[in-house]
Structure formats: C-alpha cells, structure tokens
C-alpha cells in the first residue's frame, strides 16, 4: 500500500508511517516501527504533560515560591500543572500567577467595593453622600452616616465622605 501522507487524530507521521501519540501523562521514548507500537513512559515525580504528544521530555511542575508570596492551590499531577495562588493578604500580579503583591487598601473617603482574592486586587469606590470611611482598609465598606433622628438627636456637625455626622441634643430653648 501507498505510505500515508496524513494520519488520524492522536497519531503522527514519521518515516512514512502513522504512529500513535503518547497519552497525557506520558512522554515519547521511541517511535513505532512496523513491528511495535509507539513507546511511551510515564512522566516522573513533579513532571507533567497535559496533551496527546510526542515530547521526549515532560514539563516540570510549576514551583509555588513562598518567597514570592505563593502557595499551592492545586497540586500538579502527571497530566496537569501545579496551580499557584497567593498567601492571605496578597494577590497574583498576572494570570500565570508568577508572583504576588500585597492587597491594596482603600483610603479614607473610599470603601471596599470588592474584597481582593488570591487572583484579584481590592476594588475601591468613593463613599457616596450619606456614607463615610475614616480608615485605610482592605476590608471595610463605606458606612452610612449615623441617623441622629432615630436617636432623638440632631445633627451638630455634618458628615463628609471621611467622617460621620456628629449628633447632639435638641436645643431645649426652642418652643
């Protein structure tokens, strides 16, 4: 028969014949011959290959370097890479999560709209009228001004986006 010019899925063409690719988690040792199938062997400890392949070397699992604030979120297998995330209070600087930075804090006058995760930074928003934040925090939302009326008090000092209102007793001299 004519030697093939193309091969089926999960095969590759070598020396005018179609050989099976190695399955995920295994590397190529030797191509198939007319007598034997492709020779594949398992990836070693801390190695992986995540596709059908003809790689002669497995890839090393990613190292989650604690010196960069990283920790293991999901341990790698022979078919998957290790997934890193950041230590508490830190988040990844990129999608690949190769290093971490400290979560940003929201300054006074701003509150936390979305708390940071291992992969995203804190999202801050300005405190709208009626709300304030007097601290720099990565967790605190804007707080509503105190309602003096519900305490039978009156506003003595107006609130700002950074300060609460100051309530005081009602002026008893007024009729």
């Amino acid at each position: 028969p004519e030697p093939p010019t193309a091969c089926r899925e999960k095969q590759y063409l070598i020396n005018s014949q179609c050989c099976s690719l190695c399955q995920p988690g295994q590397k190529l040792v030797s191509d198939c011959t007319e007598f034997t199938e492709t020779e594949c062997l398992p990836c070693g400890e801390s190695e992986f290959l995540d596709t059908w392949n003809r790689e002669t070397h497995c890839h090393q699992h990613k190292y989650c370097d604690p010196n960069l604030g990283l920790r293991v979120q999901q341990k790698g297998t022979s078919e998957t890479d290790t997934i890193c995330t950041c230590e508490e209070g830190w988040h990844c600087t990129s999608e690949a999560c190769e290093s971490c930075v400290l979560h940003r804090s929201c300054s006074p006058g701003f509150g936390v709209k979305q708390i940071a995760t291992g992969v995203s930074d804190t999202i801050c928003e300005p405190c709208p009228v009626g709300f304030f934040s007097n601290v720099s925090s990565a967790f605190e939302k804007c707080h509503p001004w105190t309602s003096c009326e519900t305490k039978d008090l009156v506003v003595q000092q107006a609130g700002t986006n950074k300060t609460d209102v100051v309530c005081g007793p009602q002026d008893r001299l007024r009729a």
Partner: antibody
Framework: QVQLVQSGAQVKKPGSSVKVSCKAS????????ISWVRQAPGQGLEWMGM????????SYAQKFQGRVTMTRDTSTSTVYMELSSLRPEDTAVYYC????????WGQGTLVTVSS | QSALTQPPSASGSPGQSVTISCTGT?????????VSWYQQHPGNAPKLIIY???KRPIGIPDRFSASKSGNTASLTVSGLQADDEADYYC??????????FGGGTKLTVL
C-alpha cells in the same frame, strides 16, 4: 527498519577505559532512546543506562553512576558508551538496544579486561 | 534497584505449555504496565517477544502470551517446540528513567 551496528571486540587492562560505539541506520536517529545492556559470560542481562539522542539526556543505573558516560554524535547517527576504571569483572558482551523496550538490538561487543 | 526474581530453570515436553514467573515489587512490576520479555539463544543477542505486559511484536507467534497480577508477571509458552529452548528474561520499567531485568530462566524442551 532500525539497524544497530556496534564496534568490534576490545581487550583492555584493569584501570583503563573502553569506548563502544553503536551506529544506527533506518528510522529517525533523534526519535528513539538507546539503552546499553551488558552480559557477563554465563550471566544474565544487566541494564546500564540510556541516552536520548534528541537532547542527549542520559540516565544511568545506580551501579554504574560515575563510571559510565553515554554520548551521541547526531551527524553520524552514532551513540557511544564509555566505561572507566575497568576491572576484570567488567568482562562482558555490551549491547546497545532501541528504547527502554529494547525492540532492536546491536550484535554485541565483547570487552575483555585482563592484565 | 535489585533484579526481578525468575526461576533459574523451567522445562516441558514438545507440545506442552510452560509458564515462567517474574516477581518484582510495587515500585517496578506492580507500579507500571511496562514489562517486557526477551528470548536469547546461545551466542545471539536477546530478542523482544512481549512488551507492555502482554503485547506481541509483529511476527512473534501467539504461542507466546503473558500477563501480570500485582507484583508478578508471567510468560506462557504453549505448544512447546524444540526451537523454544533458550534463556528467557523479563524486564520492567522502575520509574525515574530506570529499568531492571530478571535474572533469567533457562527453558529446556525435553
């Protein structure tokens, strides 16, 4: 069809080194590993190590670590096995074979270590 | 790693079946489905007759069969012929790019 042709017999003195060659023809040289196996007279097979011609990476059996070196020359499709600090008990037939599976073998090279 | 354990000898009459065992550990035979068997006639290089536990290279007769259970692999030669008289070796992948052989079994056809 892959063919492996080895160099000829050698006689060596204790303490010296020997270098055996294994020339491959047929197939793509860089697409299969080469294992080295030895067999002392009247004894069984002993795996010594392997070399991956595509990158030249090697893996040696613990017993031979520090004494064996496997190299390759892609221009001549040849791999080499060098064994140093020879002792009389290294007298054996040395074989090269294709892959870990060893589905094709060289004809063998007799190395005699004698004073 | 130490050698796999094979019986030093086995025998059978023509037409009979004979089984050769190959015992390893949970780090080699038990851990991987990468057991091979070789036949070696005196003065010749070994010849692969079984790979990946039970597969036969094209051209190897189906009189040669093999299996594995736990840490032990087995080779069965059925319908014994005079030319089957040879040494038989098993090998197993042992992880980390290492391979280990059995000590060999001399098969005699009576």
């Amino acid at each position: 069809q892959v063919q492996l042709v080895q160099s000829g017999a050698q006689v060596k003195k204790p303490g010296s080194s020997v270098k055996v060659s294994c020339k491959a023809s047929g197939g793509t040289f860089s697409s299969y590993a080469i294992s080295w196996v030895r067999q002392a007279p009247g004894q069984g097979l002993e795996w010594m190590g392997m070399i991956n011609p595509s990158g030249g990476t090697t893996s040696y059996a613990q017993k031979f670590q520090g004494r064996v070196t496997m190299t390759r020359d892609t221009s001549t499709s040849t791999v080499y096995m060098e064994l140093s600090s020879l002792r009389p008990e290294d007298t054996a037939v040395y074989y090269c074979a294709r892959g870990f599976r060893m589905d094709q073998w060289g004809q063998g090279t007799l190395v005699t270590v004698s004073s | 790693q130490s050698a796999l354990t094979q019986p030093p000898s086995a025998s059978g009459s023509p037409g009979q079946s004979v089984t050769i065992s190959c015992t390893g550990t949970s780090s080699d035979v038990g851990a991987y489905n990468f057991v091979s068997w070789y036949q070696q006639h005196p003065g010749n290089a070994p010849k692969l007759i079984i790979y990946d536990v039970r597969k036969r290279p094209i051209g190897i007769p189906d009189r040669f069969s093999a299996s594995k259970s736990g840490n032990t692999a087995s080779l069965t030669v059925s319908g014994l012929q005079a030319d089957d008289e040879a040494d038989y070796y098993c090998s197993s992948y042992a992880g980390n790019n290492n391979l280990v052989f059995g000590g060999g079994t001399k098969l005699t056809v009576l």
